[in-house]
Amino acid sequence: APTSSSTKKTQLQLEHLLLDLQMILNGINNYKNPKLTRMLTFKFYMPKKATELKHLQCLEEELKPLEEVLNLAQSKNFHLRPRDLISNINVIVLELKGSETTFMCEYADETATIVEFLNRWITFCQSIISTLT
């Protein structure tokens, strides 16, 4: 059974992941640039199911494409430093989902824009945090 300290650590990591995802979405929403239209043409795979920490495997597999899209946005008005940001998310995701369990991600048939993708994972974090508090 999880201890209160391990639950607290999980909650903190989820809160950090949530903040990182919200920061990306905020940066994109603030982005007044022709590149934004191009960013929205990129398609992301969505998880068929995302209700447990092991499902973060689906997010991990999309981090490289996410970094590539964010690299497009680099400008003096975009302060998110994709490499550092994605690296941070990757570390959190690996710790949260654990490395000892092998989970094959199942994706939904429909792909999504970066905004839909981020909103989906933000909702995921919020729902799990809510069960922990």
């Epitope: 903040l19 920061m23 979405l25 929403n29 302060h79 940001l85």
Partner: antibody, heavy 113, light 107 residues
């Protein structure tokens, strides 16, 4: 005991820039994201942006986009908020807040010609 | 951006009174709501997060309730040190936004 100590009050002329610092002690600096919030005299609270002290990346409220820059120095456990092209409406107390539960004491910035 | 509307903007009450402040969000924020207390010349102090969870060290006379768009902060028995301005804040989506504040004054 977690503590945030901000730099002292500043008086600036319109068009100038101001850089406010916020030094953290009592916890792992890189562990908590830092928000900046301001409060104009007699007014409510307004979120300006957030920085991840670990990665150094930040995002800002649309209203301040292009005028605000948040940075950090991990060697001194300090985050900075720089606001440029100051106008009289920027006269306010500027707060840093770590994880929303710990706040700095505030820094009064007065913009006056 | 999500708009947060508090009511009333000010109220007068006596020590021992039960005080209720309401906060309404322009769209559902689930339970992602916090309440702060601020005294003149001081930084805001977190009282309640996640709608109803009391921050460590906050007296039990403070309580929060609600979900979705409508939230309430209740002070069961007002104490002299409770006269201050109270703010609600949503952290459901960026940018985080605050209510305009409710000033609790001595009657």
């Amino acid at each position: 005991q977690v503590q945030l100590v901000q730099s002292g009050a500043e008086v600036k002329k319109p068009g100038a820039s101001v850089k406010v610092s916020c030094k953290a002690s009592g916890h792992t600096f890189t562990r908590y994201y830092m928000h900046w919030v301001r409060q104009a005299p007699g007014q409510g609270l307004e979120w300006m942006g957030i920085i991840n002290p670990s990665g150094g990346y930040a995002t800002y409220a649309q209203k301040f986009q292009g005028r605000v820059t948040m940075t950090r120095d991990t060697s001194t456990s300090t985050v900075y908020m720089e606001l440029s092209s100051l106008r009289s409406e920027d006269t306010a107390v500027y707060y840093c807040a770590s994880g929303w539960d710990v706040w700095g004491q505030g820094t009064l910035v007065t913009v006056s010609s | 951006d999500i708009q947060m509307t508090q009511s009333p903007s000010s109220l007068s009450a006596s020590v021992g009174d039960r005080v209720t402040i309401t906060c309404r969000a322009s769209q559902s924020i689930n339970s992602w709501l916090a309440w702060y207390q601020q005294k003149p010349g001081k930084a805001p102090k977190l009282l309640i997060y996640a709608t109803s969870t009391l921050e460590s060290g906050v007296p039990s006379r403070f309580s929060g309730s609600g979900s979705g768009t409508d939230f309430t902060l209740t002070i069961s028995s007002l104490q002299p040190e409770d006269f201050a301005t109270y703010y609600c804040q949503q952290s459901y989506s960026f940018p985080p936004t605050f209510g305009q504040g409710t000033k609790v004054e001595i009657k």
